[in-house]
């Protein structure tokens, strides 16, 4: 903690403006009213303050909203919002979308991505919803960050919303994230033709059922391998050989490269050798002719 | 290291007869679909004829459908192709290559020239 | 049978230029086309599969685009070991059928 020290009459401050720099660390904290501070915010970022400076800042800032800081602050905090942990964050009620885009903009070219999750953790809580103006807001500002949020956060997500969301913005989602998105991306699509729908369903198909995989397999989609490595391990085990040949058409090609990456090294442990050479791609690992497979799972549940 | 190894060409008067073989080595031969292609003097690449993995499947080009037989023998490793009835236009330079659509690996081809 | 018509058949270019070499199927062949490279006295190597994935180990400068009837191989920088006879070939059907290739040389 800063010393506690009095502050000298000459340097007591009325406003808040650019003779700041020239304090010490221990003058700031004896000369800076936080109430003036708060107030005069939308000036802190014009000014060039170190590193050093900027903590005694939020030390201050600190003192005078123990509970979290009001939207009125969080908006003006410009690089001060650098100094900000998790913790501090997660204590904010954030609405407004202009307060997030100015916090983006600032956070931007910094490793913040725990805190920047947390900024939009608080703005859909605060929002009541993740909805369109927000969605498009995080697409425009901070590509990827659509996947920073809980999968409980996405659930709040309208289908009617799904369409605004670019491929590149489910680029770093989880297969639990995936799993909330992708039925309603299948709502949100349903109505479209087969070629079209598969273009826009594709990014969320991570988080698509064995069943919806199969049927897609019906459609000559020529799945690519990319997004067919992307599918959930669950999904592409029960597909036979048929249907995997069916759904990548011209990408089946590229299976032998994948051969030892799941979920392909998985799916040729299913199958067995005589199917997968049908393929006539050299794939290696099934089932050898003459064996029996025993699904033990069904003994187990049964017994 | 995948090696694919052809032989069997030669000189040949027309009407007559050669039974090319590949020889294949460094992977599992059998769960692989193999191609027969060729290259005329100075023309492109030309495709002869494919067979599955187990020899049950068998597709030509019409020009050479009647006249030449694509074969394998899993046991050994060697995938054949019979040429019978053949013409000066068969003159090229065969090749064997894998894959199932897309040639991965080529041999280093065997002439075949059809002159009386 | 699905013809293959390669444009243009040779052209030159220099080290560092962007090069484009086009194939068109007489009928639709959607994305069941694959480009090759070959380089005198050597085998054919396949670049791109499947109109636009780049085969494992082919250099990124590479790349492929179109469906349908219309496909372009792209090298964006050409490097020296990239002056060859380039070859398009479609299997969406048999006969497998090959384009009459284009020849990339030195300018």
């Known amino acids: 903690d800063v010393e506690r020290t009095t502050c000298p009459p000459e340097k007591e401050v009325h406003e808040i403006d650019e003779s700041l720099i020239f304090y010490k660390k221990r003058e700031l904290e004896a000369c800076v009213d936080a109430a003036l501070l708060a107030a005069q915010m939308d000036r802190v970022d014009a000014i060039p303050f170190t590193y050093e400076q900027l903590d005694v800042l939020k030390h201050k800032l600190d003192e005078l909203y123990p509970q979290g800081y009001p939207e009125s602050v969080i908006r003006h905090l410009g690089h001060l919002f650098l100094k900000m942990s998790p913790e501090d964050i997660r204590k904010w009620n954030v609405t407004s979308l202009e307060t997030l885009k100015a916090l983006l903009k600032v956070s931007k070219g910094h490793e913040m991505s725990a805190q920047v999750a947390t900024l939009i953790d608080r703005v859909v809580v605060g929002r009541g919803q993740l909805d369109k103006d927000t969605v498009d807001t995080l697409t425009a500002f901070c590509p990827g960050c659509l996947c920073s949020l809980s999968p409980e956060r996405l659930s709040s997500v309208p289908p009617s919303v799904i369409g605004a969301v670019r491929p590149q913005d489910l680029d770093t989602c989880g297969p639990r994230q995936l799993d909330v998105l992708y039925p309603k991306a299948r709502l949100a699509f349903q109505n479209m033709s087969g070629s079209e729908y598969f273009v826009k369903i594709r990014p969320f198909l991570g988080g698509a059922p064995t069943e919806d995989v199969k049927a897609l397999s019906q459609q000559n989609v020529s799945m690519d391998l990319a997004t067919f490595m992307k599918l959930r391990r669950e999904a592409v085990l029960p597909l036979t050989v048929a249907e995997v040949q069916k759904l990548l058409g011209p990408h089946v090609e590229g299976l032998k490269v994948e051969e030892q990456h799941s979920p392909v090294r998985d799916w040729i442990l299913k199958q067995r050798q005589d199917d997968l050479d049908t393929l006539g791609l050299g794939l290696q690992g099934g089932i050898p002719n003459g064996y029996l497979i025993l699904d033990l799972s069904v003994r187990e549940a049964l017994s | 290291e995948v090696q694919l190894v052809e032989s069997g060409g030669g000189l040949v008067q027309p009407g007559g007869s050669l039974r090319l073989s590949c020889a294949a080595t460094g992977f599992t031969f059998s769960s692989y679909w193999m191609h027969w292609v060729r290259q005329g003097p100075g023309k492109g690449l030309v495709w002869v004829s494919r067979?599955?993995?187990?020899?049950?499947?068998?597709v030509y080009a019409d020009s050479v459908k009647g006249r030449f037989t694509i074969s394998r023998d899993n046991a050994k490793n060697t995938l054949h192709l019979q040429m019978n009835s053949l013409r000066a236009e068969d003159t090229a330079v065969y090749y064997c290559a894998r894959g199932r659509g897309i040639m991965t690996y080529w041999g280093q081809g065997t002439l075949v020239t059809v002159s009386s | 049978d699905i013809q293959m018509t390669q444009s243009p058949s040779s052209l030159s270019a220099s080290v560092g230029d962007r090069v484009t070499i086009t194939c068109r199927a007489s009928?639709?062949?959607?994305?069941?086309l694959t480009w090759y490279q070959r380089k005198p006295e050597k085998a054919p190597k396949s670049l791109i599969y499947a109109a636009s994935s780049l085969q494992s180990g082919v250099p990124s400068r590479f790349s492929g685009s179109g469906s349908g009837t219309d496909f372009t191989l792209t090298i964006s920088s050409l490097q020296p070991e990239d002056f060859a006879t380039y070859y398009c070939q479609q299997y969406k059907s048999y006969p497998l059928t090959f384009g009459q290739g284009a020849k990339l040389e030195i300018k």
């Open positions: 067979i599955n993995s187990d020899g049950t499947s068998t």
């Open positions: 009928q639709d062949i959607g994305s069941w």
